[in-house]
């Protein structure tokens, strides 16, 4: 019997994520696979030999080699989650404990910027815990949470790059900034 | 539960490249930078830079921007870093660590110790 | 690149004493997370994102700060507190790390 630490899963809001079983293959042996959201002591879903596969609701889906697919996560599916695999002899072959954590996708960051104080902004609006990084002709400036301010004074031309991202996505906008000798918008 | 291996130690000749690797379980690979961080015997920590296993983007510090390659590979959810054209300075317990801006570098590997000696 | 100047280098204290080090930054930073390393061992996070104790980071700890002065505390010293506290900022690229606290045990 193997019990190991939670396996930490990160997963976005609004996707699907699939818990696949580590270091496990599916055989004739096997005989109920169950899967059990801890918080509530609930189970979610089971695979039994010769038996119509349980699924607690739609949004859960078993496949046969033990992966349970989670469909458009939801804050609420933030859990730990437990998978007992048994063989035909009833005896606990395998358990597997996920620490489930979703975040918001982070949204594509925008770039705004003026001539007159030759300064720039990057931001981005929508995400959970994002971090933004910000380049200036692929040579790394700054980073920070969800806003980054740059005055630059090395050339009116440049090709700025700005890279949002989290546990989950990530997501970056270039823009080519050119602005007139005398600094005007 | 969230593990970073690094092999034990390396010995190399002056002059030489190493590659040394990371090899990462119990989490999602994709979802942490990982990072380098140097410390010669009975001195403080120095990071030489991180890689996003997601995309591969890359940060530097200057001074090992020529030395060390940063690579990903995420069958085997392996980070790597070469270090070329060694010398004695280079001596030293090279790091993995992942780590986000608001977690900061959350697990460590056991370190490889390198040793650059004729 | 942001100088963390640690202070002091080394200390000394009798269990049950209140320690406090300091971790000072040549420009503003946001990010700040503090290291345990002892001898021969990995350095852990101890504190992160100013002042969130890593998990099974005792009670006694607490970190505070902000712009360019930042804090570790320990409550009341005991003996396998005896380590070296690195800080690290993570607001500016590079990533720097203090050169180290010291503490000692009398």
């Known amino acids: 019997k193997e019990i190991t630490n939670a396996l930490e899963t990160w997963g976005a809001l609004g996707q699907d994520i699939n818990l696949d079983i580590p270091s496990f293959q599916m055989s004739d042996d096997i005989d109920d696979i169950k899967w059990e959201k801890t918080s509530d002591k609930k189970k979610i879903a089971q695979f039994r030999k010769e038996k119509e596969t349980f699924k607690e609701k739609d949004t859960y889906k078993l496949f046969k080699n033990g992966t349970l697919k989670i469909k458009h996560l939801k804050t609420d599916d933030q859990d730990i989650y437990k998978v007992s695999i048994y063989d035909t002899k009833g005896k606990n072959v395998l358990e597997k404990i996920f620490d489930l954590k979703i975040q918001e996708r982070v949204s594509k960051p925008k770039i705004s910027w003026t001539c007159i104080n030759t300064t720039l902004t990057c931001e981005v609006m929508n995400g959970t815990d994002p971090e933004l990084n910000l380049y200036q002709d692929g040579k790394h400036l700054k980073l920070s949470q969800r806003v980054i301010t740059h005055k630059w004074t090395t050339s009116l031309s440049a090709k700025f790059k700005c890279t949002a991202g989290n546990k989950v996505s990530k997501e970056s906008s270039v823009e080519p900034v050119s602005c007139p000798e005398k600094g005007l918008d | 539960q969230v593990q970073l291996q690094q092999p034990g130690a390396e010995l190399v000749r002056p002059g030489a490249s190493v590659k040394l690797s990371c090899k990462a379980s119990?989490?999602?690979?994709?979802?942490?930078?990982m990072n380098w961080v140097k410390q010669r015997p009975e001195q403080g920590l120095e990071w030489i830079g991180r890689?996003?296993?997601?995309?591969?983007?890359?940060h530097y510090r200057q001074k090992f921007k020529d030395m060390a390659i940063l690579t990903v590979d995420k069958s085997s959810r392996t980070a790597y870093m070469q270090l070329s054209s060694l010398t004695s300075e280079d001596s030293a317990v090279y790091y993995c660590?992942?780590?986000?801006?608001?977690?900061?570098?959350?697990?460590w590997g056991q370190g490889t110790s390198v040793t650059v000696s004729s | 690149q942001i100088v963390l100047t640690q202070s002091p280098a080394i200390m000394s204290a009798s269990p049950g004493e209140k320690v406090t080090m300091t971790c000072r930054a040549s420009?503003?930073?946001?990010?700040m997370h503090w290291y345990q390393q002892k001898s021969g061992t990995s350095p852990k996070r101890w504190i992160y994102?100013?002042?969130k104790l890593a998990s099974g980071v005792p009670a006694r700890f607490s970190g505070s700060g902000s712009g360019t002065s930042y804090s570790l505390t320990i409550s009341s010293v005991e003996a396998e507190d005896a380590a070296t506290y690195y800080c690290?900022?993570?607001?500016?690229?590079?990533?720097?790390f203090g050169a180290g606290t010291k503490l000692e045990l009398k």
């Open positions: 420009s503003s930073v946001s990010h």
């Open positions: 994102d100013t002042s």
């Open positions: 660590a992942r780590g986000t801006m608001l977690d900061g570098m959350d697990y």
């Open positions: 119990g989490y999602t690979f994709t979802s942490y930078w």
């Open positions: 690290q900022q993570w607001s500016s690229n590079p990533l720097t």
């Open positions: 890689i996003d296993p997601h995309d591969s983007e890359t």
